[in-house]
């Protein structure tokens, strides 16, 4: 007889990423005997919750919890039954709920209570539903990207095992209601609110992070629509041949469009608005989202927000990836340089509705938003964050790494389940000869 090694026992964790436009469930798994190694936790499965984000259920909190049931039922199947009780389950809500919490804290609380009630009905180890701060969202996205790319811990052999300090990747996340930029920096932050000190695997990291509320893709589009209604009577970022009817209440209900709200507007009034395929006017409209007029620090990104110069390589994910992927894949346009990204945005903005539909068959209503989306991404990176051509060359647009979605969810779970120790692990990984 000979010993047959059993496969290592697996552990599981579940995170519900309650974004502004939709909720996604991620199930992670890792070998129980290697839980302190880097790059060991990976995505087991995922599920997109049907319908809108939980913040869209402000008037119907039970609808928010009901919407999660399908994915939770899938989780019961995806996680082995004997592991249910030991599987942590978290729900983290982001900028959609941050906005709701600003405008209607009671509704925000009711939604969180309703989803909490439903999540406690499942046999998992439910550990809470809460709203992440913008800073947490940024930092956990950064942790996810660097964990998956194994930037925190690596071993080499020079007569003995040692851990060289690898450089980390910056992380840029473009959600529906906010956008985050996070990167390692050497100089102390002039604004303490934007600095986070992390101890991971015995290494110290000084990280700059900032989250811009109302600068997520959906809120930006809504703000541009409000500006177009105010200044043009047509929408320069929409394709010519695209015709809409807009209920004013739908445009001005967001706190992000509050500044553009006419004084005495009729929320039930309808306005017809058509596109004009005008890249130059569109660029001007998008420029209006950024203010560079005052900076109380030695340097700023925009809106008076401190930011050190961007340094090192970056991974840009979520709607950054979706926008660039559309330009590359659907439109067949090169986007390797900032100049190409700008040219690609202009190209899309020049297309008529008929031309766009011919390029991307099927009546995809969101097609009308890619011009504004591309213009915004290009301006946010170049003018907003200050990427020049050289720095932009170090940006990769990615949806996944190591078959795991890049976003804040994995970093959040790693943190809450203590899967990233502050102290260095033993050299088990380096001396494993199996």
């Amino acid at each position: 007889t000979r010993d047959v090694r059993e496969p290592p026992a697996l552990k599981y964790g579940i995170v519900l990423d309650a974004g502004s436009s939709h909720t996604s469930m991620f199930i992670y798994k890792w070998p129980a005997d290697k839980e302190n190694d880097t790059g060991i936790v990976g995505q087991h499965s995922s599920c997109d919750v049907p319908g809108g984000g939980i913040s869209s259920y402000a008037d119907n909190p039970s609808g928010a919890s009901q919407s999660l049931v399908g994915c939770l039922e899938q989780a019961l199947q995806d996680v082995p039954k004997e592991r249910h009780a030991g599987t942590p389950l978290y729900l983290g809500a982001t900028a959609g709920m941050r906005l709701l919490n600003l405008t209607n804290p009671e509704a925000s609380t009711s939604v969180l209570m309703a989803v909490t009630h439903t999540l406690t009905q499942y046999p998992f180890d439910f550990r809470g539903a809460r709203i992440l701060s913008g800073q947490e969202e940024g930092v956990f996205g950064w942790v996810t990207a660097n964990y998956l790319l194994e930037n925190f811990i690596k071993y080499g052999w020079v007569g003995r095992w040692f851990r060289p300090r690898k450089g980390t990747l910056g992380a840029m996340d473009l959600g529906g209601a906010s956008t985050q930029i996070t990167f390692e920096t050497t100089s102390p932050a002039e604004d303490r609110a934007s600095e986070v000190q992390l101890h991971l695997y015995g290494q110290h990291y000084r990280v700059y992070t900032h989250s811009f509320l109302c600068y997520g893709r959906d809120q930006v589009l809504q703000r541009l629509l409000a500006s177009a209604l105010q200044t043009h009577g047509f929408h320069p970022c929409w394709p010519r041949g695209f015709s809409t009817q807009v209920l004013l209440g739908d445009v001005y209900q967001s706190p992000c469009t509050m500044a553009q709200r006419p004084q005495n507007f009729n929320s039930s009034a309808r306005v017809s608005l058509s596109g004009s395929s005008d890249p130059h006017l569109c660029r001007d409209l998008v420029s209006g989202l950024f203010s560079f007029s005052s900076c109380p620090f030695s340097r700023c990104s925009f809106n008076g927000v401190f930011q050190p110069p961007v340094a090192g390589n970056f991974v840009a994910f979520s709607a950054f990836f979706a926008t660039v992927d559309f330009l590359r894949t659907s439109m067949g346009l090169p986007v390797a340089t900032l100049q190409q990204l700008e040219a690609a945005a202009v190209n899309v903005c020049n297309q008529t509705w008929a031309q766009l539909q011919a390029r991307v068959p099927g009546q995809r209503a969101r097609l009308a938003d890619y011009c504004a989306g591309a213009m915004f991404v290009q301006q946010l990176l170049s003018r907003g964050y200050g990427f020049d051509e050289r720095a932009f060359g170090g940006v990769i647009f990615q949806k996944k790494a190591a078959d795991t979605a890049v976003g804040w969810a994995l970093g959040y779970m790693l943190n809450l389940t203590n899967l990233i120790p502050a102290d260095p692990p033993g050299l088990r990984k380096g001396t494993d000869f199996s």
Epitope: S21, H22, D48, P50, G51, G52, G53, D218, Q222, L225, R240, G241, F242, S243, T244, Q245, V246, L247, D250, V251, S272, L273, S274, T352, W353, A354, Q357, P361, G362, Q363, R364, A365, R366, A368
Partner: antibody, heavy 124, light 111 residues
Framework: EVKLEQSGPGLVKPSQSLSLTCSVT?????????WNWIRQFPGNKLEWMSY???????NYNPSLKNRISITRDTSKNQFFLKLSSVTTEDTATYYC?????????????????WGQGTSVTVSA | DIKMTQSPASLAVSLGQRATISCKAS??????????MNWYQQKPGQPPKLLIY???NLESGIPARFSGSGSGTDFTLNIHPVEEEDAATYYC?????????FGGGTKLELK
């Protein structure tokens, strides 16, 4: 208020062409919207046929593409349907309708303004 | 083309009761987390009238007793409480892909 009024013959012979007119009042067909033709067969089944957009672009149902044409006369604020080589299968009530994308974080194509309908029989 | 299948073909409901109409699409009519599904009401001798867009959004002027729900391929129109003027044929319609397609209709009669 947007109003659509239809006109055209109620009887067409097989192999001939069916021609219908939709006159729009209360809104200029060049200002916005999509100006559609939809038909409803005797069993009540509805079929979207085509639209001409406010800027003159056409969009046709692929199942009818080689037989259908949609045009407009902007001076009269009218748009027209021509369906060639008709058969008895084309017997239906034909509606013209004004559509647009209803905004609500995304854009939802709806047909909100309808003509009264024209019953067309294809028979020898 | 996306095929829309409605059930039942007809139903009879008493005044004040609930009417539930289902619509199934041959493929998902969702995109980017939004459902591109509309519901229309048609009374004899009249053109269809828009009731609901985006699966659950009530068109202005439509009474709150009408409600829509669902996502992906499965959608439902509920009418509660049913009133006399609701006797009509109801159609679902997807607008996610060209060409827009309609369900076969559900005729609602009052008992």
């Amino acid at each position: 208020e947007v109003k659509l009024e239809q006109s055209g013959p109620g009887l067409v012979k097989p192999s001939q062409s069916l021609s219908l007119t939709c006159s729009v009042t209360g809104y200029s067909i060049t200002s916005g919207y999509y100006w559609n033709w939809i038909r409803q067969f005797p069993g009540n089944k509805l079929e979207w046929m085509s639209y001409i957009s406010y800027d003159g672009d056409n969009n046709y149902n692929p199942s009818l593409k080689n037989r259908i044409s949609i045009t407009r006369d902007t001076s009269k604020n009218q748009f027209f349907l021509k369906l060639s080589s008709v058969t008895t299968e084309d017997t239906a009530t034909y509606y013209c309708a004004g559509g647009y994308y209803r905004y609500g974080l995304s854009y939802y194509y709806v047909m909100d303004y309808w003509g009264q309908g024209t019953s067309v029989t294809v028979s020898a | 083309d996306i095929k829309m299948t409605q059930s039942p073909a007809s139903l009879a409901v008493s005044l004040g009761q609930r009417a539930t109409i289902s619509c199934k699409a041959s493929q998902s009519v969702d995109y980017d987390g939004n459902s591109y599904m509309n519901w229309y009401q048609q009374k004899p001798g009249q053109p269809p009238k828009l009731l609901i867009y985006a699966a659950s959004n009530l068109e202005s002027g439509i009474p709150a007793r009408f409600s829509g729900s669902g996502s992906g391929t499965d959608f439902t129109l509920n009418i509660h409480p049913v009133e006399e003027e609701d006797a009509a044929t109801y159609y679902c319609q997807q607008s996610n892909e060209d060409p827009p397609t309609f369900g076969g209709g559900t005729k609602l009669e009052l008992k």
